[in-house]
Interface confidence: low
């Protein structure tokens, strides 16, 4: 009968052959007179086989990532006679695998949106990178998955690629952050391959800052003649936020006289002075308020960030007009 | 600090050879890929050979291939380039310059000053 | 081979102005793409790579965009020390190819 072990072959040996094993019959008595023959894909090309001996050779670099097995033929036959010595055979030549496949992340570019201040341990993204390597062999492709660019404030769990928040972070700083996440095979161990991929992280607005006014001063004028309803000018805050929580709301805070209102340009953010009642430049000539400035919308969460609402002063004077 | 020093340049006929050696210092060297490129006088940068880290893999620009050979020692933190069959467009500084992070993903980050080749007769 | 165009071939700026470099690959290489920046006599020096990642030592001045084929380098306010020669470069694919260089002089 015939006499074999199991074929296997690395993948991608450099080597101009490989001996991969010895192919005989039980008959054989070493006196060179079995003649041993390859058939099937691959013979003579890719695996040869020693006529006298049945040692088989693979005689260039395979890839298994190509093609991860060979199946052949073998026959052996009576030089003298000619005639079979055993059936022809079936055989499998396995290519086995090296860490010669870089982990690849296939769904690239990445892109994720998380609020700002999120707690540390948010979920941000995961990433997932694959290895052609044969998941089978050894730790060729195992991956682990590490940051190269993205500390403090990211963190990697090195099994998932799930990607999280490790310190909070506010918007206002900076409003978006490039991630770079690598995955190497071999679980991280020596002769291990590498692939990395860029994750564009954008921060979305909270509402985590107050509305604050420009100037601690403003001085109007309003005319003695001016009718009621009368806008005499307008006052200013600025917010760091964006959209709407950077809408906000103007009120008087202090107004003893009761002349004046304030109402809130939602277009331009501007709080407009309005003249409640008539002025009399005779019976007073100058007037002092003071407004304050509120974000439209504040979550009970955020509520924090608003305690005190910004205030200031606007002193405003009234101009004499001749009277018959 | 990170420095690469090229030498070995020179004038050299049509048909010979010239070995370029690069001196690096600062880092681990076996840690990082190599490579060197070349800018003739006038002209813009051309890649001429890349090796991995470990020295197990080379890779080379087809315009060199079979006549230039890319070797490092790890052990002297030197990279080498063996130039042969050497041509008149050959001529240009060639500088050597180290991977990023990652072997061959963040591209050349230190290079050295170069050092001039000349072929003509 | 991958062939990596740049454009225009020479900018001509005045300081304080911004410059926009453009680079384009042949087929898509990802954010597999440095630039690097090259002065009379020097050697080149590595400014963004990954496309978009500024290397040690890189003013936030500088920055790149773009990925697939299509790539932008953007100086926002050009300084003295920024008149010089840009070349992009692809380590997405083996060979690895520059681009042919963009000049960037004062006007």
């Known amino acids: 009968g015939w006499v074999w072990n199991q074929f296997f072959v690395p993948e991608e040996m450099n080597t101009t052959s490989h001996h991969i094993g010895q192919l005989r019959s039980d008959l054989d008595n070493g006196n060179n007179s079995f003649q041993y023959k390859l058939l099937g894909a691959g013979a003579g090309s890719t695996f040869i086989i020693d006529e006298r001996t049945g040692d088989i050779y693979a005689i260039q670099k395979l890839d298994r990532e190509e093609r991860s097995l060979y199946i052949l033929r073998a026959q052996v036959i009576d030089i003298a006679t000619g005639r079979a010595v055993e059936p022809e055979s079936e055989f499998v030549i396995k290519v086995s695998d090296i860490n010669d496949n870089e982990p690849k992340f296939l769904d690239e570019p990445y892109e994720a949106i998380v609020p700002e201040m999120s707690p540390e341990g948010t979920l941000v993204i995961q990433v997932t990178a694959s290895d052609a390597d044969d998941p089978s062999s050894g730790n060729n492709a195992r991956l682990l998955y590490s940051l190269l660019q993205g500390q403090p404030y990211f963190s990697v769990e090195p099994t998932t690629g799930v990607i999280r928040i490790s310190s909070k972070m506010d918007r206002e700083l900076q409003d978006e952050y490039w991630v770079i996440i690598q995955a190497k095979d071999m679980i991280g161990q020596p002769g291990a391959l590498s692939g990395t991929t860029s994750v564009l992280i954008k921060l979305s607005d909270v509402n985590d800052n107050k509305p604050i006014f420009k100037e601690s001063l403003y001085r109007l004028t309003v005319s003695e003649s001016a009718p009621t309803g009368t806008s005499i000018g307008t006052i200013m805050a600025y917010d760091n936020d964006i959209g709407e929580n950077a809408e906000m709301d103007y009120s008087i805070e202090e107004d003893d006289s009761q002349t004046f209102d304030i109402i809130t340009n939602h277009e331009t953010q501007e709080g407009i002075v309005i003249l409640k009642k008539k002025v009399d430049f005779e019976h007073q000539n100058h007037y002092g308020i003071r407004a304050k400035v509120k974000n439209h919308h504040v979550p009970e969460q955020l509520m924090k960030y608003h305690t005190e609402a910004s205030t200031t002063f606007i002193k405003i004077q009234v101009e004499d007009v001749d009277e018959p | 600090e990170v420095q690469l020093l090229e030498s070995g340049g020179g004038l050299v006929q049509p048909g010979g050879s010239l070995r370029l050696s690069c001196a690096a210092s600062?880092?681990?060297?076996?840690?990082?890929?190599m490579n060197w490129v070349r800018q003739a006088p006038g002209k813009g940068l051309e890649w001429v050979s890349t090796i991995s880290g470990g020295g197990a893999n080379t890779y080379y620009a087809d315009s060199v291939k079979g006549r230039f050979t890319i070797s490092s020692d790890n052990s002297k933190s030197t990279l080498y380039l063996q130039m042969n069959s050497l041509r008149a467009e050959d001529t240009a500084v060639y500088h050597c310059?180290?991977?990023?992070?990652?072997?061959?993903?963040?591209?050349?980050?230190?290079w050295g000053q170069g050092t001039t080749v000349t072929v003509s007769s | 081979e991958i062939v990596m165009t740049q454009s225009p071939v020479t900018l001509s700026l005045s300081l304080g102005e911004r410059a926009t470099l453009s680079c384009r690959a042949s087929q898509s290489i990802s954010s597999n793409l440095a630039w690097f920046q090259q002065k009379p006599g020097q050697a080149p020096r590595l400014l963004i790579y990954g496309a978009f990642t500024r290397a040690t030592g890189i003013p936030a001045r500088v920055s790149g965009s773009g990925s697939g084929t299509e790539f932008t380098l953007t100086i926002s306010s050009l300084q003295s020390e920024d008149f010089a020669v840009y070349y992009c470069q692809q380590y997405n694919y083996w060979p690895l190819t520059f681009g042919g260089g963009t000049k960037v002089e004062i006007k």
């Open positions: 600062g880092f681990t060297f076996s840690s990082y890929a």
């Open positions: 310059a180290k991977g990023g992070m990652g072997g061959y993903y963040y591209g050349m980050d230190v």
